[in-house]
């Protein structure tokens, strides 16, 4: 628009002046005036601001508390927060990853559809016909039933979603 109908994108209005915002990684010390420019200062160690801003205080970096099963995935900078993730075998309870829980195991009759990550839990699926899982596991998929035919054997006991088939020798034909 000509002329402008607001301060420019990286500015804010104060006392009839369009002042520059502070860039990411810096905090506001003093607003600009008719005589002076906006004064900004870099955030201190373990602090950050991730947007153009007029904040007078920087935010503290997130603490990845090992007592909650957390560890640092990416160290924070003056412009970014620390990113936490969970220790091996655990996953975040929320998007913010403020605490961790143990990965869920898939019960017998269920197999792992998707292995858990630091941010998502195990996804289980029921074993379909022809497949089984006889263990409680966070890694095992459903296994296919043994094929008795390929071993020249016959099914002596049908399989279920929790058990494999039992194969046995074929009955000999009597004379």
């Amino acid at each position: 628009p000509e002329p402008p109908t607001a301060c420019r994108e990286k500015q804010y209005l104060i006392n009839s002046q369009c002042c520059s915002l502070c860039q990411p990684g810096q905090k506001l010390v003093s607003d600009c005036t008719e005589f002076t420019e906006t004064e900004c200062l870099p955030c201190g160690e373990s602090e950050f601001l991730d947007t153009w801003n007029r904040e007078t205080h920087c935010h503290q970096h997130k603490y990845c508390d090992p007592n909650l099963g957390l560890r640092v995935q990416q160290k924070g900078t003056s412009e970014t927060d620390t990113i936490c993730t969970c220790e091996e075998g655990w996953h975040c309870t929320s998007e913010a990853c403020e605490s961790c829980v143990l990965h869920r195991s898939c019960s017998p009759g269920f197999g792992v559809k998707q292995i858990a990550t630091g941010v998502s839990d195990t996804i289980c699926e029921p074993c379909p016909v022809g497949f089984f899982s006889n263990v409680s596991s966070a890694f095992e998929k459903c296994h296919p039933w043994t094929s008795c035919e390929t071993k020249d054997l016959v099914v002596q006991q049908a399989g279920t979603n929790k058990t494999d088939v039992v194969c046995g020798p074929q009955d000999r034909l009597r004379a």
Partner: antibody
Framework: QVQLVQSGAEVKKPGASVKVSCKAS????????MYWVRQAPGQGLEWMGW????????TYAQKFQGRVTMTRDTSISTAYMELSRLRSDDTAVYYC??????????????????WGQGTLVTVSS | DIQLTQSPSFLSASVGDRVTITCRAS??????LAWYQQKPGKAPKLLIY???TLQSGVPSRFSGSGSGTEFTLTISSLQPEDFATYYC?????????FGQGTKVEIK
């Protein structure tokens, strides 16, 4: 204090291109639009256009469309104005100027509060 | 394009004189007008913006008035350092044009 320091004088042949730089200091470069104005010897001031240093988006006066390119490098707080297919009537002092916006009576009023020292571009065969 | 016509183009005055420069716009520009002072070999310097607001650091002998199509720059008591060329600029419609200038010389 705010300073806009421009590159030195240039002599170019007709048909050539020239690139003038304007290094800003004393303020947050990406926070203020930068304008380019030229002045032919003994003549008045002519507005060429502006660049948003944050996004890099330029707006050019129609007269210079297709011949002028305004760019910036935020890492070194520098704006550039390149003029191509130079003619003798492009001989002028080229200025960069920072935009200031004042708010009053419900309106936003722009003006140019800081100017570079100027760069003389001479186009001669 | 909006045309700005300054009058006079040339003005001869003495130290202590009251000087008035007029700037007329070819169409209404509300108060989107600025005044600049330029000395030989130097960049322009902002004096007045929003038609009548004095830029910080500019002596109070300078004042601006007007709205719409007619504007004036007044120097209440001309000082030796005021001998220069003065330009008005409209900032409401692209291109943001300048007046042709008014040169103030010592009588």
């Amino acid at each position: 204090q705010v300073q806009l320091v421009q590159s030195g004088a240039e002599v170019k042949k007709p048909g050539a291109s020239v690139k003038v730089s304007c290094k800003a200091s004393g303020y947050t470069f990406a926070g203020y639009y930068m304008y380019w104005v030229r002045q032919a010897p003994g003549q008045g001031l002519e507005w060429m256009g502006w660049i948003n240093p944050d996004s890099g988006a330029p707006t050019y006066a129609q007269k210079f469309q297709g011949r002028v390119t305004m760019t910036r490098d935020t890492s070194i707080s520098t704006a550039y104005m390149e003029l191509s297919r130079l003619r003798s009537d492009d001989t002028a002092v080229y200025y960069c100027a920072r935009e200031k916006i004042y708010y009053g009576s419900g309106n936003y009023y722009p003006s140019f509060d800081y100017w570079g020292q100027g760069t003389l571009v001479t186009v001669s065969s | 394009d909006i045309q700005l016509t300054q009058s006079p183009s040339f003005l001869s005055a003495s130290v202590g004189d009251r000087v008035t420069i007029t700037c007329r716009a070819s169409q209404g520009i509300s108060s989107y007008l600025a005044w600049y002072q330029q000395k030989p070999g130097k960049a322009p310097k902002l004096l007045i913006y929003a038609a009548s607001t004095l830029q910080s650091g500019v002596p109070s002998r300078f004042s601006g008035s007007g709205s719409g199509t007619e504007f004036t720059l007044t120097i209440s008591s001309l000082q030796p350092e005021d001998f220069a060329t003065y330009y008005c600029q409209q900032l409401t419609s692209y291109p943001w044009t300048f007046g042709q200038g008014t040169k103030v010389e010592i009588k």
